[in-house]
């Protein structure tokens, strides 16, 4: 019969035959022959390969660095990679979270409209006519004006996106 | 042909070194892991160590191989190698190549390497 | 290191015959199933004769079966013909970062 010229899949072509591919969580050690299948073997303690292949190396798991603020989120298999994450405060800087940056902190006038995770940073949003924000944080949302007429009391100072009204007393009417 | 062919053994006094080798043919060298198992005259098989595929050529030796015996290849040449040094009276044996790690799917037919002054 | 344990040493038997070899591993092999039987002739080099501890190469008559797991492995012969009286080694595989293979001290066939 004629030598293959194509493969079917979780299969490669080598030396004018079709191999087995390894299947996840095995590398390559030597091809298949005529007469026996392609020899893999497990990868490694803090290894992994995460497809059929024919790697002759497995990967290293990702290292989740302390000193970066980095933590396991999720342990590695010999299937897949290990997921990190950031410590509480932190979020990664990019979606392959390499590293971390302390959350952003909503100035004076801003409100936490998103509470980081650790993998988003905080998002901050103007606080509208009516709101006010008087603190730099992390979790604070902006706060409503106070009511002062459901103290029966009357504005005395208009409120800003950064203070709050002043209420006071009402003018007494005179006699 | 798919085949492979031992040569360099011989006659070697103790303390001696030599090199063998084995050529490949009839097959991707690269991309097999390739070992070495001796066979002293009379006696059962004994595993000596094993060279992976890939770039860097991970090995793997038997604890008695260790310091004394090196594996390399040369992937151009399609030629396994096994440097044995500080040989002794117990190394004469028949010596194999191998493909495989984990079972062994072809054998050359070895060459005879004896200690002796 | 892994210690590769095979019996009997040596077994006399006829054409026809059922013969059964075992090994033992001192520890289990990796994925519980990396563990191959040989064939060797005198003055021959060995001959794969089982892989993964039951799989045949294609080629091997079919009277020649493996079975185990772990640390316990047989090789039969269901029907032992002349061509079958050889030495069969058992060779288990532990990691490539732990003293890789280990051979059993072979088991002689020979005739009755």
């Known amino acids: 019969p004629e030598p293959p010229t194509a493969c079917r899949e979780k299969q490669y072509l080598i030396n004018s035959q079709c191999c087995s591919l390894c299947q996840p969580g095995q590398k390559l050690v030597s091809d298949c022959t005529e007469f026996t299948e392609t020899e893999c073997l497990p990868c490694g303690e803090s290894e992994f390969l995460d497809t059929w292949n024919r790697e002759t190396h497995c990967h290293q798991h990702k290292y989740c660095d302390p000193n970066l603020g980095l933590r396991v989120q999720q342990k590695g298999t010999s299937e897949t990679d290990t997921i990190c994450t950031c410590e509480e405060g932190w979020h990664c800087t990019s979606e392959a979270c390499e590293s971390c940056v302390l959350h952003r902190s909503c100035s004076p006038g801003f409100g936490v409209k998103q509470i980081a995770t650790g993998v988003s940073d905080t998002i901050c949003e103007p606080c509208p006519v009516g709101f006010f924000s008087n603190v730099s944080s992390a979790f604070e949302k902006c706060h409503p004006w106070t009511s002062c007429e459901t103290k029966d009391l009357v504005v005395q100072q208009a409120g800003t996106n950064k203070t709050d009204v002043v209420c006071g007393p009402q003018d007494r009417l005179r006699a | 042909e798919v085949q492979l062919e031992e040569s360099g053994g011989g006659l070697v006094q103790p303390g001696g070194s030599l090199r063998l080798s084995c050529a490949a043919s009839?097959?991707?060298?690269?991309?097999?892991?390739m070992s070495w198992v001796r066979q002293a005259p009379g006696k059962g098989l004994e595993w000596v160590g094993t060279i992976y595929a890939g770039s860097n050529g991970n090995t793997d030796y038997a604890s008695w191989a260790k310091g004394r015996f090196t594996i390399s290849k040369d992937t151009s040449k399609t030629t396994l190698y096994l440097q044995m040094n500080s040989l002794r009276a117990e190394d004469t044996a028949t010596y194999f190549c191998?493909?495989?790690?984990?079972?062994?799917?072809?054998w050359g037919q070895g060459t005879l390497v004896t200690v002796s002054s | 290191d892994i210690v590769m344990t095979q019996s009997p040493s040596s077994l006399s038997a006829s054409v026809g015959d059922r013969v059964t070899i075992t090994c033992q591993a001192s520890?289990?092999?990796?994925?519980?199933?990396?563990l191959a039987w040989y064939q060797q002739k005198p003055g021959q080099a060995p001959k794969l004769l089982i892989y993964l501890a039951s799989t045949l190469p294609s080629g091997v008559p079919s009277r020649f079966s493996g079975s185990g797991s772990g640390t316990d492995f047989t090789l039969t012969i269901s029907s032992l013909q002349p061509e079958d009286f050889a030495t069969y080694y058992c060779a288990g595989y532990k990691s490539s970062s732990t003293d890789g293979t280990a051979f059993g001290q072979g088991t002689k066939v020979v005739i009755k």
């Open positions: 191998a493909r495989g790690a984990s079972y062994f799917t072809l």
């Open positions: 009839g097959f991707d060298f690269s991309s097999n892991a």
């Open positions: 520890e289990s092999v990796v994925s519980n199933n990396r």
